[in-house]
Interface confidence: low
C-alpha cells in the first residue's frame, strides 16, 4: 500500500523519498520563507483502517516571509534603509498558475551569504515564484537537495542611487529612512572629501595614493557609483 | 509554577527518548534578560510541534499542562513589553535535545528572577 502525492502547502515544497506506508516526510519552506513557529512541517503516510486507503496526514505547516528579510532592521548611522511592503499572496503562485501537488524542487530557507561591505547591506528576498536564483544555499537537515536557484536581491545601501522600479514582490513604494546621524555624517564626509581635495592640490604624490584608497572603498555616499556593485542587484529592481 | 514547568520538561525529555522525532525547532540558546518573555513564548510555541509530531497522548497532555502553567506564570508578571527582540523565526533551528536543554535554562532564568 502506498500514498498518493502529498497535498500542496503554500510557499513550501516536498521531496518525497518514499510513498510507502508510515513514511514520514517533511515539507520545506521555499527560499525567502520560514516555517512559522508552532507549526509542523511533518506529514506521514497513514492507513485509514476503515477504507484501507493510505493518505498523507495534513501538516499544520505555515510558511511565512522570513522576518529577517521583511524587517527594516535598525540601520547603522551611515545607512539609508530601503524597504517595501510585503504583499499578501492572493493566489498560490504569482503566475496565476497553480502549483502541482508535489514538486521536486525543495530548498530550505537558504542561508545566503553575501559580502557585506560597510555602509551597504545586501538582503536576499525571494518572491513566491520559482525559477529564481540563489547565491548559495545549504542542504536542509533532512537531506533534501537544495536547488541552486536565483534569488532576488534588494539593496539596502547608503547610496541614494537606487534605480526606480518595482520590486519583484510587487513593492511599488520605496520607503527611505534617513537618520539624523546620517545627515551629519554626510556633512562630515563632504568636509573630509573637500579636505582631501585641497590636500591633493598641495601634495600631488600623496594625493593619488589617498584618492585610490578612497575609490577602493564601497560607495558610501553615492557620489561615484561603481557599476558592478549595483549591477548584482539592480537588474531585479 | 516554574518549578512545575521544569518537571514537565523533564517528563517530556523522558517520553521522547523512545521516539524518533527529527524535528528541528527554533531555539534561543543565549537569552538576553530583556528578551526573556519573547524567547519563552517562542519556546512554548515550538513545544507544540513536539506534541503534534509525537502523536503521543502523554506528551500531548504534558505539553498542554506545561503551556498552561507557563502562561499563568507569565501573566502573573503583568504585561511586559519587550522591544528589539528576535522573532521566533529568526532563531537558529536546533534538534529536540538542544531545544529542551535551552528551554530548561530559560525556565531557570525565570526561577532565579522571581
Amino acid at each position: 500500500i502506498t500514498c498518493p502525492p502529498p497535498m500542496s502547502v503554500e510557499h513550501a515544497d516536498i521531496w518525497v523519498k518514499s510513498y510507502s506506508l508510515y513514511s514520514r516526510e517533511r515539507y520545506i519552506c521555499n527560499s525567502g520563507f520560514k516555517r512559522k513557529a508552532g507549526t509542523s512541517s511533518l506529514t506521514e503516510c497513514v492507513l485509514n483502517k476503515a477504507t484501507n486507503v493510505a493518505h498523507w496526514t495534513t501538516p499544520s505547516l505555515k510558511c511565512i516571509r522570513d522576518p529577517a528579510l521583511v524587517h527594516q532592521r535598525p540601520a547603522p548611522p551611515s545607512t539609508v534603509t530601503t524597504a517595501g511592503v510585503t504583499p499578501q499572496p492572493e493566489s498560490l503562485s504569482p503566475s496565476g498558475k497553480e502549483p502541482a501537488a508535489s514538486s521536486p524542487s525543495s530548498n530550505n530557507t537558504a542561508a545566503t551569504t553575501a559580502a557585506i561591505v560597510p555602509g551597504s547591506q545586501l538582503m536576499p528576498s525571494k518572491s513566491p515564484s520559482t525559477g529564481t536564483t540563489e547565491i548559495s544555499s545549504h542542504e536542509s537537515s533532512h537531506g533534501t537537495p537544495s536547488q541552486t536557484t536565483a534569488k532576488n536581491w534588494e539593496l539596502t545601501a547608503s547610496a541614494s542611487h537606487q534605480p526606480p522600479g518595482v520590486y519583484p514582490q510587487g513593492h511599488s513604494d520605496t520607503t527611505v529612512a534617513i537618520s539624523t546621524s546620517t545627515v551629519l555624517l554626510c556633512g562630515l564626509s563632504a568636509v573630509s572629501l573637500l579636505a582631501c581635495y585641497l590636500k591633493s592640490r598641495q601634495t600631488p604624490p600623496l594625493a593619488s595614493v589617498e584618492m585610490e584608497a578612497m575609490e577602493a572603498l564601497p560607495v558610501t555616499w553615492g557620489t561615484s557609483s561603481r557599476d558592478e556593485d549595483l549591477e548584482n542587484c539592480s537588474h531585479h529592481l | 509554577n516554574w518549578v512545575n514547568v521544569i518537571s514537565d520538561l523533564k517528563k517530556i525529555e523522558d517520553l521522547i527518548q523512545s521516539m524518533h522525532i527529527d524535528a528541528t525547532l527554533y531555539t534561543e540558546s543565549d537569552v538576553h534578560p530583556s528578551c526573556k518573555v519573547t524567547a519563552m513564548k517562542c519556546f512554548l510555541l515550538e513545544l507544540q510541534v513536539i506534541s503534534l509530531e509525537s502523536g503521543d497522548a502523554s506528551i500531548h497532555d504534558t505539553v498542554e499542562n506545561l503551556i498552561i502553567l507557563a502562561n499563568n506564570s507569565l501573566s502573573s508578571n503583568g504585561n511586559v513589553t519587550e522591544s528589539g527582540c528576535k522573532e521566533c523565526e529568526e532563531l537558529e533551528e536546533k534538534n529536540i535535545k538542544e531545544f529542551l536543554q535551552s528551554f530548561v535554562h530559560i525556565v531557570q532564568m525565570f526561577i532565579n528572577t522571581s
Partner: antibody, heavy 118, light 107 residues
Framework: EVQLVQSGAEVKKPGESLKISCKVS????????IGWVRQMPGKGLEYMGI????????RYSPSFQGQVTISADKSISTAYLQWSSLKASDTAMYYC???????????WGQGTLVTVSS | EIVLTQSPGTLSLSPGERATLSCRAS???????LAWYQQKPGQAPRLLIY???RRATGIPDRFSGSGSGTDFTLTISRLEPEDFAVYYC????????FGQGTKLEIS
C-alpha cells in the same frame, strides 16, 4: 477529538450589531486556519473568509470584504464573525470550519442561525 | 475568480444504483485543490474527498473522486439510503469557491 462548537441562534433587527463565536478544542488552535461559510435559506454554501489565529492573518472573499469582520482570541481558542450593522439579507446559517493549511475544510461547527427581521 | 458549475442540479436515483456527479471549473484547477462535501438537511457539511480523489478519514470506499483540469467527478458506486443529500464541490487554496450543489434524491 477535534470539535468546533458555535454559539446559539440569534434573532436581530436590521441595523443592529452581532458577533457570533466558534470555540475549538482537540487541536492547537493557533496552527490551523478557521474559515467561515454562509448558507442562506434553501441555498448553497458561500465562502466568506478565513483567519489564521496564530497571527490573525485574515483573508476575505471579495463578496464579503467590508461586510463582516473575522477575528480570533487565542487565549480562549475562539474565532468570531461579526457585523456592525445587520441587514435582512444577512439572514442565514453561518458555519465555521477548520482549514488544514490552505487545504479543504476538514472539520465543521454545527452552525449558527442568524435571523434578521424588523 | 474561478466559478464551479455542478451538474445535474438534481439527480433522482434509487438505492443500489450508481451516482455520477459532475463539477466543471471555469478555468483549470489543480487537482490538489478540489474537494467534495456532503450535506444532509439540518446538518453541517461533511468532507468526503480532498485533492480531487483522496477520501477523507472515515469515508466509505463507495465514494470516489476523479478528474483534473476543469472536469471533476464524484462517483458513489452503490447508493445507500443515507447517501441521499446535497453534494458540493469546492476549489480551495488561497481562494475558496463552492459549486452551487447537486441534490441527490430518491426516485
Amino acid at each position: 477529538e477535534v470539535q468546533l462548537v458555535q454559539s446559539g441562534a440569534e434573532v436581530k433587527k436590521p441595523g443592529e450589531s452581532l458577533k457570533i463565536s466558534c470555540k475549538v478544542s482537540g487541536y492547537f488552535f493557533t496552527t490551523y486556519w478557521i474559515g467561515w461559510v454562509r448558507q442562506m435559506p434553501g441555498k448553497g454554501l458561500e465562502y466568506m473568509g478565513i483567519i489564521y489565529p496564530g497571527d490573525s492573518d485574515t483573508r476575505y472573499s471579495p463578496s464579503f470584504q467590508g461586510q463582516v469582520t473575522i477575528s480570533a482570541d487565542k487565549s480562549i481558542s475562539t474565532a468570531y464573525l461579526q457585523w456592525s450593522s445587520l441587514k435582512a439579507s444577512d439572514t442565514a446559517m453561518y458555519y465555521c470550519a477548520r482549514g488544514g493549511n490552505w487545504n479543504c475544510f476538514d472539520y465543521w461547527g454545527q452552525g449558527t442561525l442568524v435571523t434578521v427581521s424588523s | 475568480e474561478i466559478v464551479l458549475t455542478q451538474s445535474p442540479g438534481t439527480l433522482s436515483l434509487s438505492p443500489g444504483e450508481r451516482a455520477t456527479l459532475s463539477c466543471r471549473a471555469s478555468q483549470s484547477v489543480s487537482s490538489s485543490y478540489l474537494a467534495w462535501y456532503q450535506q444532509k438537511p439540518g446538518q453541517a457539511p461533511r468532507l468526503l474527498i480532498y485533492g480531487a480523489s483522496r477520501r477523507a478519514t472515515g469515508i466509505p470506499d463507495r465514494f470516489s473522486g476523479s478528474g483534473s483540469g476543469t472536469d471533476f467527478t464524484l462517483t458513489i458506486s452503490r447508493l445507500e439510503p443515507e447517501d441521499f443529500a446535497v453534494y458540493y464541490c469546492q476549489r480551495y487554496g488561497s481562494s475558496h469557491t463552492f459549486g452551487q450543489g447537486t441534490k441527490l434524491e430518491i426516485s
